[in-house]
C-alpha cells in the first residue's frame, strides 16, 4: 500500500492482519481492519472462564494443603510428642527449664526473622514505587487504530516542518514508474529523516520492546 | 524379672574414649526413663545422664556434659553411654538404672555394673 | 545443686538394736503441689548394687521389710531399722531427686558388732 489514501478509498475485501510494528506505523494507523468475528459464543466463554476459575480454585486449595503439610512435617520434627513416662520430678523441672529457653530461642530467632521480612517489605514497596515513578516518567501511549490520512499524520506529528516534508513527497510522486525500486529506497531515507527530526527512533525503540 | 546387664567398660587412657551398652529384658523398655549413675572407687555414687523413654529429652550433670552422651535403642532394648576425653576421675563402676513408674520416684532397678579404669 | 549431707559416716550395732540414720539436703525437697518430699534411700551390700528401700521419704519399695521406715519432710530425713538383722549389713545412701542434677549423699556404713 502506497500508504496516502484518504478515508473515501474503497477497502479491501479482506485484508491480511498487520502485524503491529513501527515500521509500518503509517500503514497501520491508515489501513482499515475488518473487526475480527469471534468464534466462541458468550455462554461458551462464560462457562470457559468459569471452568479457568475452578481450576485456579482447586489449584490454590492445592497449594494451600501443601502449605498445611509442610506446616505439619515441619511441626512433627521440631516439636515431638513429650515423653514424661518414667520422668522423676526433678527431670520434668529440668525439662521444663529446656523448654521454656527453647521458646526463649525461638522467640528471638521468629524476632530477627520478623525484623528481616519487615525489612525486606519495606524495600519492596520502595522498589514497587520507584518502578512505578520510572513508569510515569515513560509512559507509553496507548495506541487506537483511528483512519487518519498520511498529510494529517505528519502534520500532527512535525507541526511546522509538515510543508517542507509534503512537498518533498509530491515530488517523490512524480518520479516514474521505472524508478519504483529507487524511491521505495529513498522513501525509507526520508522516512529515517523525519524520525530523527521528531524523536521517533526513541519511540519505536520503546514500541517494539 | 526386671534385668539390665552392662557391659563395655575396661581400661582406657586419659584422653581415650569408650562406649558403655546396657541390655535391658523383663519390662517394657522404650516406656521407661534410663539413667547412668557411677560409684567412684570411694563408694561415693554420681549421677551421669538420664535418657527418656522415646530419647527425646536428656540430662547430663556439668560434670560430663560435653564429654560423654547418652542414648537408646529402643527396638534392640538397649542404653548406650559414649565416654570421649576421659579423665582419671571418670575411674568409677558404671551402673544402668531404670527409672520408677511415672507416680512414683527413684532408680528401682540397677544392673551389676561395669568397671571403667582411666589410668596411664 | 542440692548438696546431700548424711551422718554418720559408719555405725556399729548389735543384732535386734533399733537404728537411726540422718540425711540432710541444703534445700527444701518438698514439692507443695502434691506435699511430696523427693528423696529416696538405697541399700548397698557388698559386691551388689544398690537397691532402692524408700521413696518419696516415706513410701517403702514393694518387698522391703516393714522394719524399715522412712520420715522427715523439706530438708531433714531419717531412715529407721526398727531391729537390725545381719542381712542388713550395707551401706545406706540418700538421694535427692528434686532437681537435676540428681545428688546422693556420701553414705552410712551399717556395721556389725
Known amino acids: 500500500a502506497d500508504g496516502s489514501s484518504d478515508a473515501a478509498r474503497e477497502p479491501r475485501p479482506a485484508p491480511a492482519p498487520i502485524r503491529r510494528r513501527s515500521s509500518n506505523y503509517r500503514a497501520y494507523a491508515t489501513e482499515p481492519h475488518a473487526k475480527k468475528k469471534s468464534k466462541i459464543s458468550a455462554s461458551r466463554k462464560l462457562q470457559l472462564k468459569t471452568l479457568l476459575l475452578q481450576i485456579a480454585k482447586q489449584e490454590l486449595e492445592r497449594e494451600a494443603e501443601e502449605r498445611r503439610g509442610e506446616k505439619g512435617r515441619a511441626l512433627s520434627t521440631r516439636c515431638q510428642p513429650l515423653e514424661l513416662a518414667g520422668l522423676g520430678f526433678a527431670e520434668l523441672q529440668d525439662l521444663c527449664r529446656q523448654l521454656h529457653a527453647r521458646v526463649d530461642k525461638v522467640d528471638e530467632e521468629r524476632y530477627d526473622i520478623e525484623a528481616k521480612v519487615t525489612k525486606n517489605i519495606t524495600e519492596i514497596a520502595d522498589l514497587t514505587q520507584k518502578i512505578f515513578d520510572l513508569r510515569g516518567k515513560f509512559k507509553r501511549p496507548t495506541l487506537r487504530r483511528v483512519r487518519i490520512s498520511a498529510d494529517a499524520m505528519m502534520q500532527a506529528l512535525l507541526g511546522a516542518r509538515a510543508k517542507e516534508s509534503l512537498d518533498l513527497r509530491a515530488h517523490l510522486k512524480q518520479v516514474k514508474k521505472e524508478d519504483t525500486e529507487k524511491e521505495n529506497r529513498e522513501v525509507g531515507d526520508w522516512r529515517k529523516n523525519i524520525d530523527a527530526l521528531s524523536g521517533m527512533e526513541g519511540r519505536k525503540k520503546k514500541f517494539e520492546s | 524379672e526386671v534385668k539390665l546387664e552392662e557391659s563395655g567398660g575396661g581400661l582406657v587412657k586419659p584422653g581415650g574414649t569408650l562406649k558403655l551398652s546396657c541390655a535391658a529384658s523383663g519390662f517394657t523398655f522404650s516406656s521407661y526413663a534410663m539413667s547412668w549413675v557411677r560409684q567412684t572407687p570411694e563408694k561415693r555414687l554420681d549421677w551421669v545422664a538420664t535418657i527418656s523413654s522415646g530419647g527425646s529429652y536428656i540430662f547430663y550433670p556439668d560434670s560430663v556434659k560435653g564429654r560423654f552422651t547418652i542414648s537408646r535403642d529402643n527396638a534392640r532394648n538397649t542404653l548406650y553411654l559414649q565416654m570421649n576425653s576421659l579423665r582419671s576421675e571418670d575411674t568409677a563402676m558404671y551402673y544402668c538404672?531404670?527409672?520408677?513408674?511415672?507416680?512414683?520416684?527413684?532408680?528401682?532397678?540397677w544392673g551389676q555394673g561395669t568397671l571403667v579404669t582411666v589410668s596411664a | 545443686d542440692i548438696v546431700m549431707t548424711q551422718s554418720p559416716s559408719s555405725l556399729a550395732m548389735s543384732v535386734g538394736q533399733k537404728v537411726t540414720m540422718s540425711c540432710k539436703s541444703s534445700?527444701?525437697?518438698?514439692?507443695?503441689?502434691?506435699?511430696?518430699?523427693?528423696l529416696a534411700w538405697y541399700q548397698q551390700k557388698p559386691g551388689q548394687s544398690p537397691k532402692l528401700l524408700v521413696y518419696?521419704?516415706?513410701t517403702r519399695e514393694s518387698g522391703v521389710p516393714r522394719r524399715f521406715r522412712g520420715r522427715g519432710r523439706g530438708t531433714r530425713f531419717t531412715l529407721t531399722i526398727s531391729s537390725v538383722q545381719a542381712e542388713d549389713l550395707a551401706d545406706y545412701f540418700c538421694?535427692?531427686?528434686?532437681?537435676?542434677?540428681?545428688?546422693f549423699g556420701a553414705g552410712t556404713k551399717l556395721e556389725l558388732k
Open positions: 538404672a531404670r527409672h520408677h513408674n511415672p507416680d512414683k520416684s527413684g532408680f528401682a532397678y
Open positions: 538421694q535427692q531427686h528434686y532437681s537435676t542434677p540428681l545428688t
Open positions: 518419696f521419704a516415706s
Open positions: 534445700q527444701s525437697l518438698l514439692n507443695s503441689s502434691n506435699q511430696k518430699n523427693y
